[in-house]
């Protein structure tokens, strides 16, 4: 399916609005520090050029690849060396090395100020004054902070953002209408970004075989009535889409995603009974809906797997003939029977089955060797079941904030070398698993919890890769994608860690504490808790609880005082001294 001009092809397929949005996202994800106006200028230039190619595909440069065109455009930025340092060296390379170089310089934790939400009236005025610029600014600000955000999905978020302002800026109580919608978009956006980051890490660090295995398991759970061939086709197409988006090929990715949605809607009968309501929606909403669609009901009478995967005399023959196909079918058959298992557990089971066949098919009596293979699965299944049970009990007992604190202590003891902001961010997010998953029925708890934890732990891995400080983190992150969570769960107190020297400055607080939001106060307290554990890794739960209770009381007292700053100055050192004594 070759075209004389790739840029013209994509412009025609996507339409001007989506084309411009995706190019803006691509540029913002590559050059994360560039000002908005600079990106808008570049996007307009690319769009004008694309239009000339639509008019005449033989026009000069229209035959160039998108990477060449976009890379050339990015390399025209005047301040590249000053702003990005060594990233400017990418411009000396030829494609495809230049694009790979840009990808390697994407920053998962860019030094950008947190987005401050203006007053509702200010936002509504900006929306009405120039809707197009307002929405472009949204795409730019999200994309530069989330350089792996799934681009076609970001267009969907932007459409919802637009709809929220269009509706709420007309409302009697603008704030009551708008703010909950913006909160929801922010939270969903962060979750979407983190999920996509795991997909990209899976592809980039472990290869497309790892991603395909994940996709077979997940799609087989979603579409248990679909044939293996159908699931395989969807997996192949989905892998192409995500490979493109993770590789910065956002126009191709969005185009292929639209094709996949079209295919699924044209073939609902052989995929799932749950697709109907998605398929009536417009493109962006349709693709989102299909990605989030609930699992179809399992067929009524699925037989046990023993006959084909243990009892058959042809197991080793079938395995040897086409290993990945045979393992893929095993994973498909297992996953469609177990929507109650996490994808990561299903992948561990497939890995265990593969290891058994590798060993047994070379043995004197293969059948005798692998006859009990399914019995070996039981501990693998029970480990996450028990983990979810124990942690949900702890969450129900403590509530979210104290559950997060328990995880902060647990993870700081495991990997105390990791920076305090990273430990706070990751542990707070790990703690959100309780509210997200523990209220669900038994059959949905494990897939919710373990697959969510995989996403959060990937964030730890991504941040740690940028600044490696712990061999244990590196080991858990790089050895096996599917065993990351069990690897972290198994870590104990780091006995080799030399406790951090006490620094009174770390535990000095001021009156500004009193004006913080509840969330910001929690983060301050949790930052102090991590620092305490780094100072005294062997402190008991009771000791830490005592110090934290005293901290809360001290802050509450000073925030009620007439002269707050004087109170913090006087009571702060007392709190520090009492804490040191309590932890001695």
């Amino acid at each position: 399916d070759t075209h004389k001009s790739e840029v013209a092809h994509r412009f025609k397929d996507l339409g001007e609005e989506h084309f411009k949005g995706l190019v803006l996202v691509a540029f913002s994800q590559y050059l994360q520090q560039c000002p908005f106006e600079e990106h808008v200028k570049l996007v307009n230039e690319v769009t004008e050029f694309a239009k000339t190619c639509v008019a005449d595909e033989s026009a000069e440069n229209c035959d160039k690849s998108l990477h060449t065109l976009f890379g050339d455009k990015l390399c025209t930025v005047a301040t590249l060396r000053e702003t990005y340092g060594e990233m400017a060296d990418c411009c000396a390379k030829q494609e495809p090395e230049r694009n790979e170089c840009f990808l390697q310089h994407k920053d998962d934790n860019p030094n950008l100020p947190p987005l401050v939400r203006p007053e509702v009236d200010v936002m509504c005025t900006a929306f009405h004054d120039n809707e197009a610029t307002f929405l472009k600014k949204y795409l730019y600000e999200v994309a530069r902070r989330h350089p792996y955000f799934y681009a076609p999905e970001l267009l969907f978020f932007a459409a919802r953002y637009k709809a929220a302002f269009a509706e709420c800026c007309q409302a009697a109580d603008k704030a009551a209408c708008l703010l909950p919608k913006l909160d929801e978009l922010r939270d969903e956006g962060k979750a979407s970004s983190a999920k996509q980051r795991l997909k990209c890490a899976s592809l980039q660090k472990f290869g497309d075989r790892a991603f395909k295995a994940w996709a077979v398991a997940r799609l087989s759970q979603k579409f248990p009535k679909a044939e293996f061939a159908e699931v395989s086709k969807l997996v192949t197409d989905l892998t192409k889409v995500h490979t493109e988006c993770c590789h910065g090929d956002l126009l191709e990715c969005a185009d292929d995603r639209a094709d996949l949605a079209k295919y699924m809607c044209e073939n609902q009968d052989s995929i799932s009974s749950k697709l109907k309501e998605c398929c009536d929606k417009p493109l962006l909403e349709k693709s989102h809906c299909l990605a989030e669609v609930e699992n179809d009901e399992m067929p009524a009478d699925l037989p046990s797997l023993a006959a084909d995967y243990v009892e058959s005399k042809d197991v080793c023959k079938n395995y040897a003939e086409a290993k990945d196909v045979f393992l893929g079918m095993f994973l498909y058959e297992y996953a469609r029977r177990h929507p109650d298992y996490s994808v990561m557990l299903l992948l561990r089971l497939a890995k265990a089955y593969e290891a058994t066949l590798e060993k047994c098919c070379a043995a004197a009596d293969p059948h005798e060797c692998y006859a009990k293979v399914f019995d070996e699965f039981q501990p693998l299944v029970e480990e996450p079941q028990n983990l979810v049970k124990q942690n949900c009990e702890l969450f129900e007992q403590l509530g979210e904030y104290k559950f997060q604190n328990a995880l902060l202590v647990r993870y700081t003891k495991k990997v105390p070398q990791v920076s305090t902001p990273t430990l706070v961010e990751v542990s707070r997010n790990l703690g959100k698993v309780g509210a997200k998953c523990c209220k669900l029925p038994e059959a949905k708890r494990m897939p919710c919890a373990e697959d969510y934890l995989s996403v959060v732990l990937n964030r730890l891995c991504v941040l740690h890769e940028k600044t490696p400080v712990s061999e244990k983190v590196t080991k858990c992150c790089t050895e096996s994608l599917v065993n990351r969570r069990p690897c972290f769960s198994a870590l104990e107190l780091d006995e080799a860690y030399v406790p951090k020297a006490f620094n009174a400055e770390t535990f000095t607080f001021h009156a500004d504490m009193c004006t913080l939001s509840e969330k910001e106060k929690q983060v301050k307290k949790q930052t102090a808790l991590v620092e305490l554990v780094k100072h005294k890794p062997k402190a008991t739960k009771e000791q830490l609880k005592g110090v934290m209770d005293n901290f809360a009381a001290f802050v509450e007292k000073c925030c009620k005082a007439d002269d707050k700053e004087a109170c913090f100055a006087e009571e702060g050192p007392k709190f520090v001294a009492a804490s040191q004594a309590a932890l001695a």
Epitope: S304, A306, D340, A443
Partner: nanobody, 115 residues
Framework: QVQLQESGGGLVQPGGSLRLSCVAS????????MGWYRQAPGKQRELVAS???????HYADTVKGRFTISKDNAANMVYLQMNALEPEDTAVYYC?????????WGQGTQVTVSS
């Protein structure tokens, strides 16, 4: 060794009700399917009702609206509530529990619907 034991069968008049129970003893983990099948004299064994791990239920057309299948995961038990019984429901009813490693059957319990 896994064993299934059905109970609750018996003789009942047309229009009456029975509740069948089935309990699994022994270690069975990873159950994905629990079902009730029946076999009338001289006929093939047929699926009456099944319930899967995701809570989906499936009923034979002849029993829809009259029979209800339910389960207790913690106790590895499956039930069949049978209302508005008809003479055609007379059969031996078998309980079936499946995990990926095997398909486990009970010995059956006789249900007779007769006036």
């Amino acid at each position: 060794q896994v064993q299934l034991q059905e109970s609750g069968g018996g003789l009942v008049q047309p229009g009456g009700s029975l509740r069948l129970s089935c309990v699994a003893s022994g270690s069975i983990w990873g159950i994905y399917h629990m079902g009730w099948y029946r076999q009338a004299p001289g006929k093939q064994r047929e699926l009456v009702a099944s319930i899967t791990v995701d809570g989906s239920t499936h009923y034979a057309d002849t029993v829809k609206g009259r029979f209800t299948i339910s389960k207790d995961n913690a106790a590895n038990m499956v039930y069949l509530q049978m209302n508005a019984l008809e003479p055609e429901d007379t059969a031996v009813y078998y309980c079936d529990i499946r995990n990926v490693g095997g398909d486990y059957w009970g010995q059956g319990t006789q249900v007779t619907v007769s006036s």
